[in-house]
């Protein structure tokens, strides 16, 4: 057993261009806190996977308000160390995740809000009992400087905290086969304490609390002989005399994994895959309980009242993640139809619909022509969420109420003069042009470049546009 200790030295903008904006402002003061998550081995697991070696949250740092115009300085930090106790041996190699969180203290609805500013991760080798190791990690434009160490809790000593030390019983020397405990020369290494009940003849241990079996013996306490009677199972090495060895109960028989862990056999023993919130050889240890306040953004911690039960966070609408740490971008799913504008109000989604559409998701196409009349013989045409009128000749406007001036748009080309006529308009073309809109030049030989003039009309005559 022992404690992993993390000391944050600074968190601020990293070197180089593109310094980040301060996470706090006069309008939105904030303070920082940190979370550390430890996992055994050099794993590259997802950030959401269990912190099997343990996790810890720091206290909140001092409230910080940005000075307008000033560059983002190193931000004020919480006091004290982050301490992650570990119950079993220190693994020597470990992976870490250190998260920097911002607690916004502005007067926003819902009180303080939490958001993840930066997350750094790494894999390291570290012997317990050694000096502080210094580290610098960058996350985007931010830089985190920190130190860490692992130390054993008495009576454990050694690089893995597996050797036990006891005060000397005799003043001069340690007992038979036991060495003095460096650096505590006045103490003696104690014999390893195997798991209670572990067979002294057929079992042994390399770490406190374990029980490993000598060949030919099995079971959690190495008290069950390996049967050689017949070959009923493929388990065990083959033998020339018996054909094979069939163990009695397998290491996973009776499921030694607590708290819903699943057991799988390994060449030498078994391995438990633990549910979230549990770790240890048999999933018997819980890293985080509801008392640690693992749920952010108003999440409610359910279960996890003690180290023997996993917690879950029930997240308020708009947040998700195992700790309610992720804001849900519900508008990214484009829930508003027919070009509606999506608004995420936190507690609910709203769609602001374009004209002519309605419904919670703008899914209803309104009957644009319902109750709308087009004047002067016009007919209503639906389309695109808005009604329009197709007006009778000589009328215009949204509802065909305006008498149209057919010449207002200057329809006659090449200097032709426009005359309003009861059935439309007439263009009087300039010399050299012809057509309903005076659009065709007349060739010098008198023939038109495009359609011939209708019978009875000479080039240059006024062209009535019907």
């Amino acid at each position: 057993a022992g404690v992993f200790e993390l000391q944050i030295h600074s968190f601020g903008p990293g070197p180089g261009p593109g310094a980040p904006r301060s996470p706090c402002s006069a309008r939105l003061p904030c303070r920082l806190f940190f979370r550390v998550c430890l996992k055994p081995g050099l794993s590259e697991e997802a950030a959401e996977s269990p912190c099997a070696l343990g996790a810890a949250l720091s206290a909140r740092g001092p409230v910080y308000t940005e000075q307008p115009g000033a560059p983002a300085p190193d931000l004020p930090l919480p006091d004290g160390l982050l301490q992650v106790p570990f119950r079993d041996a220190w693994p020597g190699t470990f992976s870490f995740i250190i998260e920097t969180w911002r607690e916004e203290l502005g007067d926003q609805i819902g009180g303080p809000a939490w958001s993840l500013l930066a997350r750094v991760a790494g894999r390291r080798r570290l012997a317990a009992g050694g000096p502080w190791a210094r580290d610098i990690q960058r996350a985007g434009a931010w830089e985190l400087r920190f130190s860490y160490r692992a130390r054993c809790e008495p009576p454990a000593v050694g690089t893995a905290c597996t050797r036990l030390c006891r005060p000397r019983s005799a003043p001069s020397r340690c007992g038979p086969g036991l060495r003095p405990c460096a650096p505590l020369e006045d103490e003696c290494e104690a014999p390893l304490v195997c798991r209670a009940g572990c067979s002294p003849e057929h079992g042994f241990c390399e770490q406190p609390g374990e029980c490993r079996c000598l060949e030919g013996w099995t079971g959690p306490l190495c008290t069950v002989p390996v049967s050689t009677s017949s070959c009923l199972s493929p388990r065990g090495p083959s033998s020339a005399t018996t054909g094979c060895l069939v163990p009695g109960p397998g290491p996973c028989d009776g499921n030694p994994c607590a708290n819903g862990g699943s057991c799988s056999e390994t060449p030498r023993s078994f391995e438990c895959t633990c549910p979230r919130g549990f770790y240890g050889l048999r999933c018997e240890v819980s890293g985080v309980t509801c008392a640690d306040g693992p749920c952010f953004n108003g999440g409610l911690c359910v279960g996890g009242a003690d180290p023997d039960s996993a917690y879950i966070c029930h997240c308020p609408p708009g947040f998700q993640g195992s700790n309610c740490e992720k804001r849900v971008d519900r508008c990214s799913l484009q829930p508003c139809r027919n070009g509606g504008l999506c608004l995420d109000l936190g507690h609910a989604l709203r769609c602001r619909c374009r004209a002519g559409f309605a419904g919670p998701r703008c899914e209803h196409d309104l009957d644009d022509c319902a109750g709308r009349a087009c004047a002067n013989g016009g007919t209503c045409v639906e389309g695109g969420g808005a009604h329009r009128c197709s007006c009778a000749l000589g009328f215009g406007g949204r509802d065909c109420r305006e008498r149209a001036d057919p010449c207002a748009a200057r329809p006659c080309a090449h200097g032709g003069r426009c005359y309003a006529h009861f059935s439309g308009l007439v263009c009087a073309c300039a010399p050299g042009y012809m057509g309903a809109r005076c659009e065709f030049p007349v060739h010098p030989d008198g023939a038109s470049a495009l359609p011939a003039a209708p019978p009875g009309l000479r080039p240059g005559d006024p062209q009535r546009y019907l």
């Epitope: 609805i109 819902g110 009180g111 303080p112 509801c290 008392a291 640690d292 306040g293 952010f296 108003g298 409610l300 911690c301 359910v302 279960g303 996890g304 009242a305 029930h314 308020p316 609408p317 708009g318 936190g346 507690h347 609910a348 919670p360």
Partner: antibody
Framework: QVQLQESGPGLVKPSETLSLTCTVS????????WSWIRQPPGKCLEWIGY???????NYNPSLKSRVTISVDTSKNQFSLKLSSVTAADTAVYYC????????????WGQGTLVTVSS | EIVLTQSPGTLSLSPGERATLSCRAS???????LAWYQQKPGQAPRLLIY???SRATGIPDRFSGSGSGTDFTLTISRLEPEDFAVYYC?????????FGCGTKVEIK
């Protein structure tokens, strides 16, 4: 304006099941968690449980074996069933909306008194 | 579960006086997830404060909340006639959600 209205019988016989419905107006039932709370005459408030439209529920361990909360999004209603009632279940039963900022109660119904008596 | 103990049970004061109500938790309430409610006879409770110190919409500024960890306080700076009621605290840090048993503020 958000309004909640409890409805159901005011008198239930011992060992029977108490059934109440809360009708919500002014808010979509799909956007919030919804809860039941009770208060025996002259006594403290006791949280019974809550539900989210997705079906997520959470009940007070002291009542868990007897409580079922359900939701009907089409009617914008949620309901409470409490089985095997005794005189100790006599109380004013409130339905309430759980706030967005956390699991506290920002809107309450006016409450309905349920008496357990033969 | 977190047990909330409110004190005093009854507070006898006159209009215009300052009222200080206490709510003590059996375990630390993380992130100040604590709310205060006011209840008048025959009515449902009404939310006053959440997050230990944030006033709910429409609540007058004579009501203020403070505290953290296990000790929380509701203060009414100058009692108005309509403030005489029972006040409850509630934690929403972890399940089960729990209420205190109330402090009655009565006219002296």
């Amino acid at each position: 304006q958000v309004q909640l209205q409890e409805s159901g019988p005011g008198l239930v016989k011992p060992s029977e099941t108490l059934s109440l419905t809360c009708t919500v107006s002014g808010a979509s039932i799909s956007s919030f968690y919804w809860s039941w709370i009770r208060q025996p005459p002259g006594k403290c408030l006791e949280w019974i449980g809550y539900i989210y439209y997705s079906g997520t529920t959470n009940y007070n361990p002291s009542l868990k074996s007897r409580v079922t909360i359900s939701v009907d999004t089409s009617k914008n209603q949620f309901s409470l069933k409490l089985s095997s009632v005794t005189a100790a279940d006599t109380a004013v039963y409130y339905c309430a909306r759980i706030a967005v900022a956390g699991f506290f109660f920002d809107y309450w119904g006016q409450g309905t008194l349920v008496t357990v008596s033969s | 579960e977190i047990v909330l103990t409110q004190s005093p049970g009854t507070l006898s004061l006159s209009p215009g006086e300052r009222a200080t109500l206490s709510c003590r938790a059996s375990q630390s309430v993380n992130k100040n997830y604590l709310a205060w409610y006011q209840q008048k006879p025959g009515q449902a409770p009404r939310l006053l404060i959440y997050g230990a110190s944030s006033r709910a919409t429409g609540i007058p500024d004579r009501f203020s909340g403070s505290g953290s960890g296990t000790d929380f306080t509701l203060t009414i700076s100058r009692l108005e006639p309509e403030d005489f009621a029972v006040y409850y605290c509630q934690q929403y840090d972890r399940s089960p959600l729990t209420f205190g048993c109330g402090t009655k503020v009565e006219i002296k």
